[in-house]
């Protein structure tokens, strides 16, 4: 069995502001089992954008059905976005742990650009 | 507060079909998974169905093709088609809200399915 | 018969604690979680993702894993702690949700 594989296809993605934007994400395999997140930037200062396990993120919304029971697709919609969205998106697998979940593989990134409105 | 209730249980004969229902309330029922587990007298847990929000469905060997299980998100209702019943599907029959990975964080009371001539 | 396994029952006296062990999904691909059930009632989740416990559970039940088993620890353990409680699993290669047998736990 082939370790599991983080892939985000898009390298970059350009957005006008106030638009939707889709950050695409799939897992190549369903083990081991543990949560996926959505983080804006990389680091200790990295910003949570989206957890499936638990949160209220408002402006997200997921493509597929995550409450499938083999789903591998973790891909995001962002609502409304301005230009204080741009920056790179990471889809990071966790693998499940005790008493936290441990970060186990991360996708290559994808940079969010936002074109302003024309005035 | 989820509140989760079934019903819809009762006296079937052997062969003879039932369907039960889970009324649901409390929660967003559109965007949880959902299961049925059933507990035959004074014995342990079996998971039954499950589904996912989307209708995506899951079964247990014990009933695979035989149960049915679905929802309808505009009456937040869970069902369970149950045929070809025999005498070893007399159980009390419980929905369970499924939490994002699949254990059951919310259980109703029950509806007792009894299978008899 | 049960994928899981856990002991059919553990005596313990109030103030003591008890440990009940379940075992026989692969760490990787399951979750684990621990139900109570009292005589005529719904079982209640007291125990999720293997270690993790609801709003409302008290803090003397506490889950723990080591490789394929998990452990549910009751500690000072009281009398309305007497219940069957269950193991549950989640495992993700068969996407099915396996049960162990239940343990009755008494308080003597």
């Known amino acids: 069995e082939e370790e599991l594989q983080v892939i985000q296809p898009d390298k970059s993605v350009l957005v006008a502001a106030g638009e939707t934007a889709t950050l695409r994400c799939t897992a190549t395999s369903l083990i081991p089992v543990g949560p996926i997140q959505w983080f804006r930037g990389a680091g200790p200062g990295r910003e949570l954008i989206y957890n499936q396990k638990e949160g209220h993120f408002p402006r997200v919304t997921t493509v597929s059905d995550l409450t499938k029971r083999n789903n591998m697709d973790f891909s995001i919609r962002i609502g409304n976005i301005t230009p204080a969205d741009a920056g790179t998106y990471y889809c990071v697998k966790f693998r499940k742990g005790s008493p936290d979940d441990v970060e186990f593989k991360s996708g290559a990134g994808t940079e969010l650009s936002v074109r302003a409105k024309p005035s | 507060e989820v509140q989760l209730v079934e019903s819809g249980g009762g006296v079937v004969q052997p062969g003879g079909s039932l369907r039960l229902s889970c009324a649901a309330s409390?929660?967003?029922?559109?965007?949880?998974?959902m299961s049925w587990v059933r507990q035959a007298p004074g014995k342990g847990l079996e998971w039954v169905a499950g589904?996912?929000?989307?209708?995506?469905?899951y079964y247990g060997d014990s009933v695979k093709g035989r149960f049915t299980i679905s929802r309808d998100n505009s009456k937040n209702t869970l069902y369970l088609q149950m045929n070809s019943l025999t005498a070893e599907d007399t159980a009390v029959y419980y929905c369970?809200?499924?939490?994002?990975?699949?254990?059951?964080?919310?259980w109703g009371q029950g509806t007792l399915v009894t299978v008899s001539s | 018969s049960y994928e899981l396994t856990q002991p059919p029952s553990v005596s313990v006296s109030p103030g003591q604690t008890a440990r009940i062990t379940c075992s026989g999904g692969?760490?990787?691909?399951?979750?684990y979680a621990w139900y109570q059930q009292k005589p005529g009632q719904a079982p209640v989740l007291v125990i999720y993702?293997?270690?993790k416990r609801p709003s409302g559970i008290p803090e003397r039940f506490s889950g723990s894993s080591s490789g394929t088993t998990v452990t549910l620890t009751i500690s000072g353990v009281q009398a309305e702690d007497e219940a069957d409680y269950y193991c549950?699993?989640?495992?993700?290669?068969?996407?099915?949700?396996?049960f162990g047998g239940g343990t009755k736990l008494t308080v003597l």
């Open positions: 369970a809200r499924e939490t994002w990975n699949h254990l059951f964080d919310y």
């Open positions: 409390g929660f967003t029922f559109s965007s949880n998974a």
């Open positions: 589904i996912s929000s989307g209708s995506d469905t």
């Open positions: 692969a760490y990787s691909s399951y979750y």
């Open positions: 993702s293997d270690s």
């Open positions: 549950g699993g989640y495992d993700q290669s068969s996407y099915t949700n396996p």
